[in-house]
């Protein structure tokens, strides 16, 4: 059962796993949610009746029954983790805590103009978990405007104390606001020889990399595969760090793989969701339950629905035993990973999918697409929406992309002459325009947010957000696309598609079926040569064939230029402008979305 509200002056008795320090009960709840075993917590607020050494303590708790006895205690605030809830969860915490000093290892001290600048510095520093900033009113002259970057083993403060005229806060890496590089490559036959901060068992290097990503101290990892010569180290995932933030030594070793934490790209790549099945693999751990199940998929469902289950092993039924049902072993451990991984015993293992809700919805795999052909199939581009105007009559106006459950990203030039958001209708999950009838459900538009530097498409800033009146329930036919990571600025995308219901030639009409075209990106230098009369800025991105023939056209505006990278689709561009349509040596010009990620997040995350 999902319980989101906090219980004031209430303490849960017993069940303690560990104690951490958090600046608020709300953040304590987030820490509990991300902890592999925590189901309940008790936080102690500052209070004259409490011993100051207990202020800001966050006691993480577990219980077989998923609840614990309640005791009245002033200044105690208790609650449940969001593990039991189905809604999307985020570790992003933008709060600034006034007059609190969050203790940790102060590894960097510098002058900053503001707390915001200090927070940005922390967000863009690979080691930083949180910071404390001494304001200009701080009594000690030499400490004024000092920004202290801090880290700890757990990612949370080792203590929190009251201190006048300072402010503290957390890194915004988990808010997708870091400019740090996002290195997705996994290096085969490589061992990083730096210090280990932890080790866990993992079935493959991808799971190892995801574990590294949500481990607060891990910057890179080495994984020993099941063919690794030393038996005791097989399936071992070593979580590593270094002072520089990069591996100091790379050793060539067969059957080992190494890679980096994906913390700077975690909003656009799954890091919690281990959805694969591992055949002929047994995961060992503390047994929670043994139940009969028809298949390994059914076993995974049972594990996902059991809030304490972290992973499972399924043993298929022998011949006609037990109505063809196998045994499903639901398991857990102290850290969420198997204590040992065995091969060759016929089991099929995997992880709970409960943690998938901690990943951005946009990272969910969508169904395989049809290669070739210009007409799309249903569910192929589930982020694509058709934006209709009702003036003078109802019609397709522009394309757009779902980027959040209340947000559509589109082009600013679509709204020339649109006096009110009320006259707009957003239709999602549509393949054919002819599906849209008078009684077809749509999303009303609450607000149109146009970039305040927008003047005309050709001069850039051709970007707008639509805030919907109601939220989108994600399904296979309507779900968000990931924004590109700022750390991905140097990625060369090779699998890019433009989609829309726009014209197929300059003098044409809106198409009934959603069209798609695979189009190569063109460098800005090359693009500038083709548009000598315009300034192609770094905030624009171009795509097209030299010989022409495939391009976006009238009616495609605002729609996505979607590029697939590492199995995840990213919204790389917004269809903006071009000279004619599909003309030779006239590429289409798109708004370069990565350059507007901060603007998008500022507008969509505004309270």
């Amino acid at each position: 059962e999902c319980v989101t509200q906090l219980l004031k002056d209430t303490c849960f008795e017993g069940g303690d796993i560990t104690t951490v320090f958090t600046p608020s009960a709300k953040y304590c709840q987030v820490v509990c949610t991300y902890h592999p075993r925590c189901l309940l917590f008790t936080f102690t607020a500052e209070s004259p009746s409490e011993d100051p050494t207990r202020w800001f303590t966050c006691v993480l708790k577990d219980s077989v029954t998923e609840t614990l006895p309640r005791v009245n205690r002033t200044a105690a605030i208790s609650g449940y983790s969001f593990k039991q809830c189905s809604h999307q969860i985020s570790a992003c915490n933008k709060d600034i805590y006034v007059d609190l000093d969050m203790k940790g290892i102060n590894y960097n001290s510098s002058v900053a103009k503001s707390a915001q600048e200090c927070q940005e510095r922390c967000t863009d520093d690979v080691h930083c978990h949180f910071f404390t900033y001494a304001t200009r009113q701080f009594p000690s002259l030499e400490h004024r405007n000092i920004c202290l970057l801090k880290h700890t083993q757990t990612g949370t403060p080792t203590r929190i104390t009251k201190l006048d005229k300072v402010v503290s806060g957390f890194s915004l890496k988990s808010c997708a606001l870091s400019n740090l590089a996002c290195i997705r490559d996994i290096f085969p036959n490589t061992v990083f020889a730096d210090s280990n901060i932890d080790s866990v068992m993992a079935p493959d290097a991808f799971v190892c990399g995801r574990i590294c990503t949500h481990h607060p101290g891990c910057l890179f990892f080495t994984f020993f595969s099941q063919e690794w010569p030393k038996e005791s180290q097989r399936n071992l995932c070593l979580l590593k760090t270094s002072e520089s933030g990069l591996p100091s030594t790379r050793i060539k070793k067969s059957k080992a793989l190494s890679g980096f934490s994906l913390q700077s790209c975690r909003h656009s790549i799954p890091v919690f969701c281990h959805s694969s099945f591992y055949h002929d693999t047994d995961f060992l751990g503390e047994e929670l339950d043994i139940v009969a199940a028809k298949s390994h998929e059914a076993c995974q469902k049972l594990c996902t629905n059991a809030v304490r289950c972290q992973f499972f092993t399924y043993t298929p039924a022998q011949a006609s035993c037990n109505e063809g049902k196998g045994k499903c072993y639901l398991k857990l451990s102290s850290n969420g990973s198997p204590t040992k991984i065995l091969h060759g015993r016929g089991g099929i293992s995997g992880y709970t999918l409960r943690l998938c809700k901690m990943d951005n919805e946009c990272t969910t795999k969508i169904k395989p697409r049809i290669v070739g052909g210009t007409a799309s199939v249903r569910g192929e581009w589930p982020w694509q929406v058709t934006l209709h105007t009702t003036s003078p009559t109802q019609r397709h106006l522009c394309g757009g992309s779902i980027i959040g459950n209340q947000w559509i990203l589109t082009a600013a030039h679509c709204f020339y002459g649109v006096e009110s958001p009320k006259i707009l209708r957003v239709y999602s999950g549509i393949l054919n325009q002819s599906e849209i009838k008078e009684d077809t459900s749509f999303f009303g538009v609450q607000e149109i947010i146009i970039h305040d530097q927008y003047k005309m498409a050709e001069s850039g800033y051709d970007i707008a957000l639509l805030k919907l009146e109601t939220t989108v329930n994600y399904t296979d036919s309507q779900r968000p696309i990931c924004l590109p990571s700022k750390g991905d600025r140097n990625v060369i995308y090779t699998d890019c598609w433009v989609t829309g219901w726009g014209y197929r030639k300059l003098r044409d009409k809106i198409q009934n079926t959603l069209q798609k075209a695979k189009i190569p990106l063109v460098t800005n230098e090359e693009c500038q040569k083709r548009y000598r009369g315009h300034k192609i800025t770094h905030k624009m991105i171009c795509a097209g064939y030299r010989e022409g023939g495939k391009d976006a056209c009238k009616g495609d505006s605002g729609g996505p230029l979607s590029c697939k990278h590492n199995e995840v689709w990213h919204l790389v561009g917004i269809t903006s402008w071009g000279e004619g349509c599909a003309q030779r040596e006239r590429p289409g010009v798109y708004t370069n979305v990565v350059e507007y990620v901060d603007w998008i997040l500022e507008k969509t995350q505004a309270v």
Partner: antibody, heavy 117, light 107 residues
Framework: QVQLVQSGSELKKPGASVKLSCKAS????????MHWVKQAPGQGLEWIGN????????NYDEKFRTRATLTADTSTSTAYMELSSLRSEDTAVYYC??????????WGQGTTVTVSS | DIVMTQSPSSLSASVGDRVTITCKAS??????VSWFQQKPGQAPKLLIY???NRYTGVPDRFSGSGSGTDFTLTISSLQAEDVATYHC?????????FGQGTKLEIK
Amino acid sequence: QVQLVQSGSELKKPGASVKLSCKASGYTFTRYWMHWVKQAPGQGLEWIGNIYPDSDSTNYDEKFRTRATLTADTSTSTAYMELSSLRSEDTAVYYCTRMGFYAMDYWGQGTTVTVSS
Amino acid sequence: DIVMTQSPSSLSASVGDRVTITCKASENVVTYVSWFQQKPGQAPKLLIYGASNRYTGVPDRFSGSGSGTDFTLTISSLQAEDVATYHCGQSYSYPLTFGQGTKLEIK
């Protein structure tokens, strides 16, 4: 079922103003544009303008922009058209019509306005 | 403004005849054309929308065609009750405009 009921005939002197009403029922009034169309005796149809009741957005034909004012009262689901500085050529039947999904699908019965001294 | 030119302005035909009325737009209006029927003393009624879609309850002897600038309303077999004035109108862009009407009579 959708119905548009217009106010009764009006006889006005030149220079006066007239305010016509159009009461809508059977649908969500705020979600559809309401248009006004003029038909002079023995003539074709002439578009005056439209209003979106949910936002009070309006559009007018240039010819009527200075003299026609479209308003809507969402509490009573009624659209209004006020025509000022009346002259003899304003003598006509005035229709309110709902812009449905793709076209003007429902029409009021019309209001006859006669301008005569 | 987009001018809609309707022809003929009047026509007389016999019951059972195939009747065609045309409407020409001064510029491309894609398929944003509607046809209306207006009987004496009554308000106009929608027959065809989107150039070729028959409105609910309209007999299938009425059909519309065309796109861009040239549009046609066809009555495949004229009936006595079809005596009326027929109007075309464009809703592609403001201001909305109508043809001058075609008065249809029975011979």
